[in-house]
């Protein structure tokens, strides 16, 4: 039960963060007019990865595509690939995450396949979420330094009467939203990894421990398997479905002293 | 039609206060933003306050900060400028002006209502 | 705060004269973020109260008509009557619209000879 639920409760996290990159990523607000100690304007103006915006007193907002690749700066340039990557990987995993998930049933797909692809799907999570976060950490860092240089530099003009003013930005809603979300899909990508560790069958095959009881040869295997007469069936450790309800997360029952007949 | 009717206006004596109103009709009230402009006799246009649509935005500068107060009801599609601690140089036509969708543009304007500050 | 200096303080013209009138700022009113001067023009004729001409520099307000011509960037600022009729006999106001506290210019008197 613990695995169904660390693997379900890891896919809802990791879509909850994947939808909140992609969120990120579409943003205008990933930075904004700084306001504080700056000259009250009547425009508010932020910038996202694909359009800057100018809000005006009235409300009206008007946004201006980036209509160039080559005349934008390499790091915003980074920080889209970084985002867009992310926002790929997350996808796969999410996809690969549906059919690992223990609560649907494809076939007659294997415990180790789920469990392959449990673990495929948790690491996609794990990288997608560190795109995420490395994207917004530079974007970050660009603003920061650009911060610092617009403040050393604020009035810019010509020592005389007219002066210029430049905008400075600081850090918007999409930076935020982007830390969260990539800290989500990290997460559920940590949380898919772990469960991947319980849904794996173990990789040793345990001896069977025989009881010798009024002449019949009745081998054991512990962890729930059933037990197959004689040593020559079953040895491969494959689950025998009895059709009941029961999950592979239940308490599992070994031979006890009272086992045999 | 956009209309802008202010009302209020009179002799005050120095140091006294008044209470400028402005009636709008013609469009949704509660959407716009709006100023308050004088005129002072023969002089040019000067800015006296500013409020958003929701009253949560509110300038001034600095020749009225803390003497006027701007308000305004947006179900009576009123606006209001209390003015208090006046001085001879408050006199002038005051304006009731929406600010217009774009271009923070002053667009339309009433036709005004006179203020004299005199002993 | 932002300083307007209209220039000339007056001017006299005959009907159907071209006429230009200056604006300067203290400051620049463009906004890099979408390129546009955050500047306005308002004429304001005898006993009445100003009405809008010209937005963002350059943009005529509907109803206006097109012998009035607004141009320039930055802190230079110009609008232009192409061919004066005698109803444009007024007073013309350049506006700051991008900084609080908004200023207006001083004014320039359109006047016939």
């Known amino acids: 039960m613990a695995v169904t639920a660390c693997q379900g409760l890891g896919f809802v996290v990791s879509l909850i963060g994947i939808a909140g990159i992609i969120a990120a990523t579409c943003m205008d607000q990933w930075s904004t007019q700084d306001l504080y100690n700056n000259p009250v304007t009547a425009v508010f103006n932020y910038q996202g990865l694909w359009r800057s915006c100018v809000r005006e007193s009235s409300g009206f907002t008007e946004c201006r595509g980036y209509f160039t690749l080559l005349g934008l700066p390499a790091m915003l340039q980074a920080v889209r690939a970084l985002m867009i990557v992310g926002i790929v990987l997350g996808a796969i995993g999410l996809l690969v995450s549906i059919f690992a998930l223990k609560c649907i049933r494809i076939g007659s797909m294997e415990d180790s396949a789920k469990a392959n692809m449990t673990l495929t799907s948790g690491i996609m999570f794990i990288v997608s979420g560190l795109c995420a976060i490395a994207g917004v950490s530079v974007f970050a860092n660009m603003l920061v330094t650009n911060f610092w240089m617009s403040t050393a530099n604020m009035y810019t003009g010509m020592g005389g009467m007219v002066q210029t003013v430049q905008t400075r930005y600081t850090f918007g809603a999409a930076l935020f939203v982007g830390w969260v979300a990539g800290g989500l899909t990290l997460i559920g990508g940590v949380m898919m990894c772990i469960a991947c560790r319980g849904l794996a069958p173990e990789e040793t095959n345990y001896k069977a421990v025989s009881y010798h009881a009024s002449g019949h040869s009745v081998a054991y295997k512990p962890g729930g398997f059933k037990a197959s007469t004689g040593f020559g069936s079953n040895t491969k450790n494959k689950k025998i479905y009895d059709g009941g309800a029961r999950t592979e997360d239940e308490v599992q029952s070994y031979p006890s002293k009272h086992d045999y007949v | 039609d956009v209309q802008l009717v202010e009302s209020g206006g009179g002799l005050v004596q120095p140091g006294g206060s008044r209470k400028l109103s402005c009636a709008a009709s013609?469009?949704?009230?509660?959407?716009?933003?709006m100023h308050w402009v004088r005129q002072a006799p023969e002089k040019g246009l000067e800015w006296v306050a500013y409020i958003s649509s929701g009253s949560s935005t509110i300038y001034y500068p600095d020749t009225v900060k803390g003497r006027f107060t701007v308000s305004r009801d947006n179900p009576k599609n009123t606006l209001f400028l209390q003015m208090t601690s006046l001085r001879s140089e408050d006199t002038a036509m005051y304006y009731c002006?929406?600010?217009?969708?774009?271009?923070?543009?002053?667009?339309?304007w009433g036709q005004g209502t006179s203020v004299t500050v005199s002993s | 705060d932002i300083v307007m200096t209209q220039s000339p303080s007056s001017l006299t013209v005959t009907a159907g004269e071209k006429v230009t009138m200056s604006c300067k700022s203290s400051q620049s009113l463009l906004n890099s973020g979408n390129q546009r001067n955050y500047l306005t023009w308002y004429q304001q004729k005898p006993g009445q109260p100003p009405k809008l001409l010209i937005y963002w520099a350059s943009t005529r307000e509907s109803g206006v008509p097109d012998r009035f011509t607004g141009s320039g960037s930055g802190t230079d600022f110009t609008l232009t009557i192409s061919s004066v009729q005698a109803e444009d006999l007024a007073v013309y106001y350049c506006?700051?619209?991008?900084?609080?506290?908004?200023?207006f210019g001083t004014g320039t008197k359109l006047e016939l000879r």
């Open positions: 506006q700051n619209v991008y900084f609080y506290p908004l200023t």
């Open positions: 013609g469009f949704t009230f509660s959407s716009f933003g």
């Open positions: 002006v929406r600010l217009g969708p774009r271009g923070n543009v002053m667009d339309h």
